[in-house]
Interface confidence: low
């Protein structure tokens, strides 16, 4: 049909932190390159109907559906969604194409469905159909990777039974300690499932999909390293595979390695050895101990012995169920306004936890660091000296753990006052919680030293603002003090703060007439 306009339908996917989204539904700012949605003419439909490719959107994602119309003259339009018509404001771009946009902010279930766009141009009328659905991540999984020996080869396969199929990568490092951090230049990544180079210092396998990234480290005993002060411990759940690597370097090949479980040699088929010469002609040997599916009786001390090195052991503990061990009692802290301070939680857990720190309904990323004694620690220092309740939450496949912290900031009270026709109230958020005094200012007491004790009602910690306690004191008005100035003072060990209130006689209370 010659009269049909040339139209283009696009999807603009906005990044999560894109502050430009939604500023104007007519002129959305493009944050990522638009994705063409096709917009083909729908066959066998009454009238001219274009159908865009279906759009799948993650929960909370923000998108813009956009139509570009190459047709002469003006256009008018109307969006219809779930039988409701929505405002539509076309504009023209630099190529003089009509542009119509629909911004969907923070996608939810209620915003899923068919969006119909009716366009009227000088030449013709037509309809464009968009179908928007929520991405079904309902039953996605991301499982921690595990190792298997490759059949008939000295190589490890990394497996992660996840949905959708994850990308698997090996993360290798030949340095010690801190320099093996993810971003370090010493770290090499290989995006493949099979690894043949098994002599490195630090070997991890990671799997990632839409849900994130999970890693498993190849547990290693290095006979050339000084043993840790506490025995290294490895936890596994019944049915999981066990892999321990013993590594030793010697000036020549004249040495051997053996594995023992509780002083009994491992059975044939539960270990394999590899050796190579390093660049300085020393010999590196590695001996793997492995059990394809552990049972309770695989628990015990695994010892790697060498004819040329002191032996070293690791305690392998097989558990029925994962766990998180930590003390969950609440902790209260009191610090000065500029004192450096971090909350910290020390825990032992298997499998590894996912965790968050929360304050005032806002979540903060949670970092965990392994300690030498088998424990891990998570610290939170980003409290910006805001008093209130902080929550640490951790979970793994089998367990959950929550710990509450209260942070109090020592400071002199600040007083806010308000008054009504019948009473005056003062509020303070100082810490320690302040005590109150009320004083009347009069001719007899120009310095406001006359104390008021009648009609005073103190409420300590009467409301929580983001977990922060507020103390208040209320003075009920009596004839004796009407028309006078009164002063409320809050004091604690760090100082005193006062506010003066005029208790007006009957009239347009509490306004003071400005003559």
């Amino acid at each position: 049909n010659q009269d049909l306009p040339v139209i283009k339908c696009v999807l603009i996917n906005h990044k999560n932190n894109d502050s430009s989204v939604g500023k104007s539904s007519s002129y959305p700012m493009v944050s990522e390159s638009p994705e063409d949605l096709g917009c083909a003419l729908r066959p066998q439909s009454s009238g001219t109907v274009y159908e865009a490719a279906a759009v799948e959107v993650d929960v909370s994602a923000s998108i813009t559906l956009q139509v570009l119309v190459d047709a002469p003259g003006n256009i008018s339009c109307l969006w219809v969604f779930k039988h409701s018509s929505l405002n539509c404001q076309p504009h023209f771009d630099l190529q003089n194409r009509g542009v119509v946009s629909m911004v969907i902010l923070k996608m939810t279930e209620t915003q899923a469905g068919e969006y119909l766009l009716f366009i009227q141009s000088e030449a013709t009328n037509y309809t464009i159909l968009f179908t928007v659905s929520i991405r079904n991540t309902l039953l996605y999984t991301l499982r921690r990777p595990y190792f298997r020996k490759m059949e008939n080869q000295d190589a490890l396969v990394c497996i992660s039974e996840s949905v959708p199929e994850p990308i698997v990568e090996w993360v290798l490092c030949d340095s010690q300690g801190e320099s093996c951090k993810e971003e370090s230049p010493a770290v090499v990544k290989k995006e493949e499932k099979v690894l043949h180079e098994l002599f490195g210092t630090d070997i991890r396998c990671c799997a990632r999909n839409e849900l994130g990234r999970e890693c498993t480290r190849l547990f290693t005993i290095d006979l050339n390293q000084t043993p840790q002060t506490t025995l290294p411990q490895l936890f596994l759940k019944v049915g999981e595979p066990l892999w321990i690597r013993c590594k030793a370097v010697h000036v020549n090949h004249g040495f051997g390695l053996t594995w023992e479980l509780e002083n009994k040699a491992l059975e044939e088929g539960n270990y394999f050895e590899m050796s190579t010469y390093s660049t300085n002609r020393t010999m590196i040997r590695i001996l793997f101990a492995f059990v394809s599916s552990v049972a309770r009786n695989d628990t015990g001390y695994y010892t790697c012995s060498s004819s040329k090195h002191p032996s070293q052991s690791a305690l392998v503990t097989i558990v029925e169920k994962g766990f998180i061990n930590a003390t969950n009692s609440s902790e209260d802290y009191e610090i000065d306004q500029y004192e450096e301070f971090c909350f910290s939680v020390r825990f032992k857990a298997y499998p590894q936890i996912r965790c968050t720190w929360t304050f005032s309904r806002k979540s903060f990323p949670c970092e965990q660091k392994g300690l030498d004694n088998g424990y891990s620690i998570s610290k939170f220092c980003n409290h910006k000296h805001q008093p209130g309740e902080y929550i640490f939450h951790a979970e793994n496949d089998d367990a959950q753990f929550t710990k509450m912290f209260t942070l109090n900031i020592r400071r002199k009270p600040q007083v806010l006052a308000e008054a009504s026709a019948s009473q005056a109230s003062c509020f303070s958020d100082g810490y320690p919680l302040p005590s109150w005094t009320w004083k009347k200012c009069s001719d007899k007491s120009p310095n406001c030293t006359e104390e008021i004790t009648e009609g005073v009602w103190n409420r300590k910690a009467n409301r929580k603002v983001f977990g922060q306690w507020v103390s208040s004191s209320t003075l009920n008005m009596s004839e004796a003090i009407k028309g006078f100035l009164v002063k409320c003072c809050a004091y604690n060990s760090l100082g005193t703060s006062c506010e003066t209130i005029l208790l007006n006689s009957p009239g347009p209370f509490p306004f003071i007439q400005d003559n």
């Epitope: 929960v59 279930e109 991540t137 309902l138 039953l139 996605y140 999984t141 949905v163 849900l211």
Partner: nanobody
Amino acid sequence: EVQLLESGGGLVQPGGSLTLSCAASGRTFSSYAMGWFRQAPGKEREFVAAISWSGSSTYYADSVKGRFTISRDNSKNTLYLQMNSLRAEDTAVYYCAAGGSTRVVVTTTPVVKYWGQGTLVTVSS
């Protein structure tokens, strides 16, 4: 902790129907998204259908759309899968799955939390 127990599997002729049930123990059944997966001999476990905690939203694999219906009865702590127009390729062990303990329909956390033991469905003449 939620325990899941499937029932209703068996031998059925092509074109026939079958209803699978999954009984869940635990008071929190109604707060879980639930689903059915299946695993044919020698194949990977695959997604079949899912339903949100309230039953208001359902999802289906393309291969079963229009033939299978997932539903739930929160008062009975039971999940169902009504299977019509069964084909030989539907032969598999069917597993019931409980998602994350969440009242949202779709979630981006790793959510298959609990699995049933499975029930065998054989479609053959």
